[in-house]
C-alpha cells in the first residue's frame, strides 16, 4: 500500500501554485515510506498543504523557514 504500514500519512497530490510565503508558519517532510516524496507546509490557519520538494519555490521556502 502507498501508505505502507499505515503508520504515517502521505501526500497523493501537490499544490499546483506557490502559496504566499507569509501564510506559512512551518513545514515538515512526509515519511520515506510514502510513495511520493513531499514537503508539507503548515499555514497560519493550520492547513497542511502538500508540495513537491523538487520545485524551486518549495526549496526556497524551506530555506527561508530555516533562517527565520
Amino acid at each position: 500500500s502507498p501508505y505502507s504500514s499505515d503508520t504515517t500519512p502521505c501526500c497523493f497530490a501537490y499544490i499546483a501554485r506557490p502559496l504566499p510565503r507569509a501564510h506559512i508558519k512551518e513545514y515538515f517532510y512526509t515519511s520515506g515510506k510514502c510513495s511520493n516524496p513531499a514537503v508539507v507546509f503548515v499555514t497560519r490557519k493550520n492547513r497542511q498543504v502538500c508540495a513537491n520538494p523538487e520545485k524551486k519555490w518549495v526549496r526556497e521556502y524551506i530555506n527561508s523557514l530555516e533562517m527565520s
Epitope: 501526500c11 497523493f12 497530490a13 497542511q48
Partner: nanobody
Framework: EVQLVESGGGLVQAGDSLRLSCATS????????MGWFRQAPGKEREFVAT????????FYADSVKGRFTISRDNAKNMVYLQMNSLKPEDTALYYC?????????????????WGQGTQVTVSS
Amino acid sequence: EVQLVESGGGLVQAGDSLRLSCATSGRTFTMDGMGWFRQAPGKEREFVATISRSGVGTFYADSVKGRFTISRDNAKNMVYLQMNSLKPEDTALYYCAARPDYTLGTSSYDYDSWGQGTQVTVSS
C-alpha cells in the same frame, strides 16, 4: 463547495458493526480527498480516517486502526466508513468532510466542506 449528507448511524451493542455512508454533490467529487471525523459530547472533534482522491491512499487514527475501513465509490459520489468491533468509546457524532487533494488530510483544518453528522451510539 461540496454538499455532504451522512447516513447509517444508529444505536448498536458493543462488538457490533455499522456502515456509515456519505453522499456528495456539488464540486467535482473526484477532485477531493475525503475524511471522517467524530465528536463525542464534551470533547473536541477528532480525526478518524482519510482517503485520497483515487481511493488508493488511506490513513487511520490509532484508535480505530484495524477496526474501521474507509472507502469510496467515485462512480456513485459516495464515501463509506465500515466500523467493526465497535466499542462504547466510539460513541460520537460522525462527520464526513471534503478537502482539496493536495492537503494531507489528518487535520480538520485541511477540510473545507462538512456534513451535518450522523449519530453513532454504542452501548455496553
